[in-house]
Amino acid sequence: QNSKLRGELQALRETFSNFTASTEVEVKALSSQGGNVGRKMKSLESQLEKQQKDLSEDHSDLLLHVKQFVSDLRSLSCQIAALHGNGSTLTCCPVNWLEYEGSCYWFSRSGKSWPEADKYCQLESAHLVVVNSREEQKFIQHHMGPVNTWMGLTDQSGPWKWVDGTDYETGFKNWRPEQPDDWYGHGLGGGEDCAHFTDDGRWNDDVCQRPYRWVCEAARDPAT
């Protein structure tokens, strides 16, 4: 009886062992398949993300091109209109000039004295920039770079005056602390008579002969 039970127990052990082994194999196989599926899903996800990103970039590029095309078209039609006109007013900003709030601006890259810069702007049928508001100041600052830059403000004839006749006393001002100091010690027969934007955008008065950059401004015809 004992030996019979022993035999059955042995058989059961073997059966169970075989069952465990086969189950382990199947679990491993399933696990491996699951991993493959996961990897495939991840791969598909990343492919999808890349395609989305590429599409988004293409869309942005396209938008930029469309915007540039519209801008070029507007500029071209404007230049044609200007050719038909008598040239007394700017119907659009010339090439390499920037438009802001109805005015055209040209930012120099070289340096000239204030009188030379003033003359340059006049020859371009413009004037050295006149700053009328905080917003215009920000626009100029954004485009001028970290370099001293002449503006159309001078006190060479006495009180501070804007070159286009804008009233200085009631207008926008952005002087550095303790400026203008109109320092007379330089022996030039007058004070520091010309105003410029400093590298941080705030204003300073300086000797007019300094070779600084400058900004020209011209009014655009408001009818267009």
Epitope: G111, V147, W183, H186, P211
Partner: antibody, heavy 120, light 107 residues
Framework: QVQLVESGGGVVQPGRSLKLSCAAS????????MHWVRQAPGKGLEWVAV????????NYADSVKGRFTISRDNSKNTLCLQMNSLRAEDTAVYYC?????????????WGQGTTVTVSS | DIQMAQSPSSLSASVGDRVTITCRTS??????LAWFQQKPGKAPKSLLY???SLQGGVPSKFSGSGSGTDFTLTISSLQPEDFATYYC?????????FGGGTKVEIK
């Protein structure tokens, strides 16, 4: 530390060309104007040319205008002086010097110099 | 161009002496003036800028003053290492111009 090292000097015949270089290190080259200054044997200092920090503005002494060209490569921290149609009076030690600012604020750091001799 | 007249062209002095060099410009240059020191066979060294501001690392025995057209460089107590040639330079406008130099020699 801030350093400027000139190279490219030598003996050259009148009418020929030479290119000087100045390697800058120890500071952010692209934010400073750069100058060339020369000194003839036994003479004083003579300013030659300036180039602004971004390369947009260049100015020259009348004595070299039309013959010399100043240039810079901010990606390589290098200043150059291309000298054409050289004359005997161009014989000098050539120094590169850093502007204190973008290009109109005077000189603060000088290189050791490179000698140019124009002779037939 | 702005002309620079430096005087004297040379001077003899003893260690411990107070030395003054002057520089006069042909037109007003504000304070846009620098001073340099040069020793034989060496590159110039910047001493002062904006007429009176000391460059970093330059001893306070060097001082500058003036504005407009008349400027001075003063060495309060001359030391052996100060025997050299000194140049003024204007940088108000291009072309930058140098004075002819002042050679400070040992008496």
């Amino acid at each position: 530390q801030v350093q400027l090292v000139e190279s490219g000097g030598g003996v050259v015949q009148p009418g020929r060309s030479l290119k000087l270089s100045c390697a800058a290190s120890g500071f952010t080259f692209s934010t400073y104007g750069m100058h060339w200054v020369r000194q003839a044997p036994g003479k004083g200092l003579e300013w030659v040319a300036v180039i602004w920090y971004d390369g947009t503005n260049k100015n020259y002494a009348d004595s070299v205008k039309g013959r010399f060209t100043i240039s810079r490569d901010n990606s390589k921290n290098t200043l150059c002086l291309q000298m054409n149609s050289l004359r005997a009076e161009d014989t000098a030690v050539y120094y590169c010097a850093r502007d204190q600012g973008v290009g109109y604020d005077g000189l603060d750091v000088w290189g050791q110099g490179t000698t140019v001799t124009v002779s037939s | 161009d702005i002309q620079m007249a430096q005087s004297p062209s040379s001077l003899s002095a003893s260690v411990g002496d107070r030395v003054t060099i002057t520089c006069r410009t042909s037109q007003g240059i504000g304070k846009y003036l620098a001073w340099f020191q040069q020793k034989p066979g060496k590159a110039p060294k910047s001493l002062l800028y904006k007429a009176s501001s000391l460059q970093g690392g330059v001893p306070s025995k060097f001082s500058g003053s003036g504005s407009g057209t008349d400027f001075t460089l003063t060495i309060s107590s001359l030391q052996p290492e100060d025997f050299a040639t000194y140049y003024c330079q204007q940088y108000m406008t291009y072309p930058l111009t140098f004075g002819g130099g002042t050679k400070v020699e040992i008496k």
